[in-house]
């Protein structure tokens, strides 16, 4: 769970151990120098690519040991109460469409994560945000067009879904004041936006665990 201090630290890949070692070496050699992260990542990546299997072995062993530690700790880890209980969401409900920025992130997140393996999820998001903000309006158009199409489809699907009636809506009667209907939709939109961000974070965490070293 997010923010649980008792949750075991995520397992580190062999490449992550290598980057950590690089960083420590760099700090020893240049204790006062500030690190140009882009350059540093690039140099690390280039060095890793030229290393022999034997040289990488040390880091692979560290990663194996860390994986074992993580699995061991996860066996005894009990998530905080309520964490596993998510509010009920009808699995058949149409999924909220992604925003233009979300589509853009899906496209370029692998590149950013791949080129800068040491970046945290937050830093990856920050870099993607910078890329998006530095993008001219006409370059954003393809993503905006696609997002608009998906939104249109979602609106049709959600209208059909609501017309069919939600599991509990039938009991309560469908007639509602326009005002409360509008309010409810706004709340749902807010909830869905939170979910979208949460899903993106989860996806990121999963990807990080799945990423194989090159």
């Amino acid at each position: 769970g997010k923010g649980d201090p008792k949750k075991p630290r995520g397992k580190m890949s062999s490449y992550a151990f290598f980057v950590q070692t690089c960083r420590e070496e760099h700090k020893k050699k240049h204790p006062d120098a500030s690190v140009n992260f882009s350059e540093f990542s690039k140099k690390c990546s280039e060095r890793w690519k030229t290393m022999s299997a034997k040289e990488k072995g040390k880091f692979e062993d560290m990663a194996k040991a860390d994986k074992a530690r993580y699995e061991r700790e996860m066996k005894t880890y009990i998530p905080p109460k309520g964490e596993t209980k998510k509010k009920f969401k009808d699995p058949n409900a149409p999924k909220r469409p992604p925003s233009a920025f979300f589509l853009f992130c899906s496209e370029y997140r692998p590149k950013i994560k791949g080129e800068h393996p040491g970046l945290s999820i937050g830093d990856v998001a920050k870099k993607l945000g910078e890329m998006w903000n530095n993008t001219a309006a006409d370059d954003k158009q393809p993503y905006e067009k696609k997002a608009a199409k998906l939104k249109e489809k979602y609106e049709k699907d959600i209208a059909a879904y609501r017309a069919k009636g939600k599991p509990d809506a039938a009991k309560k009667g469908v007639v509602k004041a326009e005002k409360s209907k509008k309010k409810k939709e706004e709340e749902e939109d807010e909830e869905d936006e939170e979910d979208e961000e949460e899903e993106e974070d989860e996806e990121d965490e999963e990807e990080e665990e799945d990423d194989d070293d090159e």
Epitope: K42, S45, P110, K111, G114, E115, M131, N134, D139, Y143
Partner: antibody
């Protein structure tokens, strides 16, 4: 070693079709935008088309819009350019290129397309 | 659409001399998206300068880029024999890229 290798060029009659391929190796192809640039004999460089990492987004120069189609197969690490309704002015060396690690861009050696009757 | 115009078309110089190549955009562009390429006969182009003034990997220190808005310059402090080539300025849009090249400046031996 990072490499791009174009193929599929040749002599074709006006109105004909040709499909260029670009085989990529030495990097994670599916992370990167890919681009075709061409150069007519004795002339300058002209951007032709680009495609996003997933292949979901494409852009074309006005001179080729509606006639050329860029696509990619990430499972095969290959970029394509389907060229239809070819004209004499499409005669050029076609380069496949990508940006790799902070503006260190990589270009293929090019493949020659000649449109002539 | 943005047009990039380079001048002069040809520059005749001797080794050891300095060179100044100019590139003008038809409207103001961000220096983030301005690059310079070098191309030798029978070879693919090679990136020299990106973001108007940053040297790409492997670009010698004698090459420098400057400028902002609509006017950009590539300078070669002292020409080496291998610097005689055609130079292109390039403006880019992103994601996926859309590139606009200038028509090129040929630097030839006097």
């Amino acid at each position: 070693e990072v490499q791009l290798l174009e193929s599929g060029g040749g002599l074709v009659q006006p109105g004909g079709s040709l499909r260029l391929s670009c085989a990529a190796s030495g990097f994670t192809f599916s992370w990167y935008d890919m681009t075709w640039v061409r150069q007519a004999p004795g002339k300058g460089l002209e951007w032709v088309s680009s495609i996003s990492p997933s292949g979901g987004y494409t852009k074309y120069a006005d001179s080729v819009k509606g006639r050329f189609t860029i696509s990619r197969d990430n499972s095969k690490n290959t970029l394509y350019l389907q060229m239809n309704s070819l004209r004499a002015e499409d005669t050029a060396v076609y380069y496949c290129t990508t940006e790799f690690y902070d503006y260190l861009d990589v270009w293929g050696k090019g493949t020659t397309v000649t449109v002539s009757s | 659409d943005i047009q990039m115009t380079q001048s002069p078309g040809t520059l005749s110089l001797s080794p050891g001399e300095g060179a100044t190549l100019s590139c003008r955009a038809s409207q103001s562009v961000s220096s983030t998206y301005l690059a310079w390429y070098q191309q030798k006969p029978g070879q693919a182009p090679r990136l020299l300068i990106y973001e108007a003034s940053k040297r790409a990997t492997g670009t010698p220190a004698r090459f420098s880029g400057s400028g902002s808005g609509t006017d950009f310059t590539l300078s070669i402090s002292s020409l080496e024999p291998e610097d005689f080539a055609v130079y292109y300025c390039q403006h880019r849009h992103n994601w996926p890229p859309q590139w606009t090249f200038g028509q090129g400046t040929k630097v030839e031996v006097k």
